[in-house]
Amino acid sequence: MAVTACQGLGFVVSLIGIAGIIAATCMDQWSTQDLYNNPVTAVFNYQGLWRSCVRESSGFTECRGYFTLLGLPAMLQAVRALMIVGIVLGAIGLLVSIFALKCIRIGSMEDSAKANMTLTSGIMFIVSGLCAIAGVSVFANMLVTNFWMSTANMYTGMGGMVQTVQTRYTFGAALFVGWVAGGLTLIGGVMMCIACRGLAPEETNYKAVSYHASGHSVAYKPGGFKASTGFGSNTKNKKIYDGGARTEDEVQSYPSKHDYV
C-alpha cells in the first residue's frame, strides 16, 4: 500500500511539476522591467523566451515575437533548449509512468516490468526537473549580468533588441514558477525511484526445503528473500508457489481507490 501511495504521489507531484514547466516556458514574464527608480510607469516592459511585451497604462498590451534565430543570444537559445528538453522528457516520463502505476492493470504486465517503467519514468522526471532548474538558473544569471551591465551605462542585448540604460530588467514571475516546477518534478522523480525499489519482485528465491527434525514431523518452509535489498527483514506471511515467494498483495492487485488528477 505504501508503495502504491508513493508511486501515485510521485506521479501527481511530477504531473504538477511538468505542468508548471510548460507554463513557465510559455509565460512572457521571464524578465520584467525594474521599477526601483520609477515605481509608477506609464509603459511597462516584460520579456519571455519567445516574445517581448509592452503594457501601456491605457491597458493596451503589445507583444512582438523574436522572429529571428540567428540574432538571438546563445544563452537564450540554450535556455529554450533546456526547457524544451525538460518538457519532452517530462511528457515521456508521464506517459511511461501511467502504464507503470500499480493501481492500473494492463493485461498481464509483470511487476518487474512495472518496476522498470517506474524507475525509467523516475529518472526521466529527475532529468526533466534538472533541465528546468538549469534553464531558469541560466536565464537568471544572464539577467543579473545584464542588470549590472546596464547599470554601468552599457548597452545590453536581450531578445535580439537593443536595450538602452533606461530599461533594466529583473526577475519575472516565470523564473519562480520554473524553479518551483523543476523542484516538484525532481521530487516526483525521486519518489518514483523510491517506489520502484518497493515494486521490484523478489529476484533470488530459495527453494522450499523440508527439514525433518528428530521426533517431530514439522516441515519448515522458509519464505523467499529479496536478493541484497538492504531494506530490513521480510516479515510478511508467504504463500509458496513453485518455490517462489510472493506477498499476498502481489498475487492479485486490485485498483486502489484513488482519484487521479
Epitope: 522591467q33 509608477v40 506609464a42 520579456q47 497604462s57 491605457s58 491597458g59 493596451f60 533606461q166
Partner: antibody, heavy 118, light 113 residues
Amino acid sequence: QVQLVQSGAEVKKPGASVKLSCKASGYTFTSYVINWVKQKTGQGLEWIGEIHPRGGNTYYSEKFRGRATLTADKSISTAYMELSSLRSEDTAVYFCAILRRGNAMDYWDQGTTVTVSS
Amino acid sequence: DIVMTQSPSSLAVSLGEMATINCKSSQSLLNSGNQRNYLTWYQQKPGQPPKLLIYWASTRESGVPDRFSGSGSGTDFTLTISSLQAEDVAVYYCQNSYNYPYTFGQGTKLERK
C-alpha cells in the same frame, strides 16, 4: 459610439470643494482609463491624473496630489474628480478623456468650466 | 518630470503651403521594449476639446487626413502639415505619454498668412 458627458458649469467660493462628473457611454466602462486635464482660459493643457475604473487605481500629477481625488462608480459608468481647497487659479475648463493605445487621449468631453470667485 | 518644449509658439502659413511644428522633450520618449516613441500630437480649435492627431510619434489616428504626419525619435519630434487647409487653423500640442506625469508642450498657434 463612445461618448463622454460632463456635469454643468460650477461657480465656487475660495476654500470650497467641487465634484465634477464624467459619464461614459458607448463602451464597457471598465475597459479604458479615464484622464482629467485642466486648461486655463487662453493657456495650455495640464494633466491632473488618471483613474483605472476596473481596479480603482489612481495616478496624480504632483501638483494636484492631495487636492484632487479621482473616483469611479462602475454601476453608473461615471468617473468623478473632486477638487478641494479651491483657489482663484483653479478657475479653468476641466476635461475628462479616455486613454487608448499609445497612452493617447482619443475621446474628450466638451469640458466643464469651474469658476472660483469670492 | 519630462519637460516638453514646442517651437515656434506661433506660426503663420499660407493655404496650400507646408507647416512644420517642432517638439523637444527633456528625456528620451523611446521605449526600448517595442522601439516606439511615446509622443502624442493634439489639435485644438477655439471652444472645442483637443482632438487626437498622432500617437507613437508617427501613427495617424483613424479619420485624420493624411496631410498630417509625425516624425522623430528619442527627444526631437516634428508634426508636418503638407498642405495647409483653412480648417487646420488651430493650436497644436505635443504630449509626453511615456512617463507620469503626462506633460504637454506649451502649444503652437497655427494661423493662415
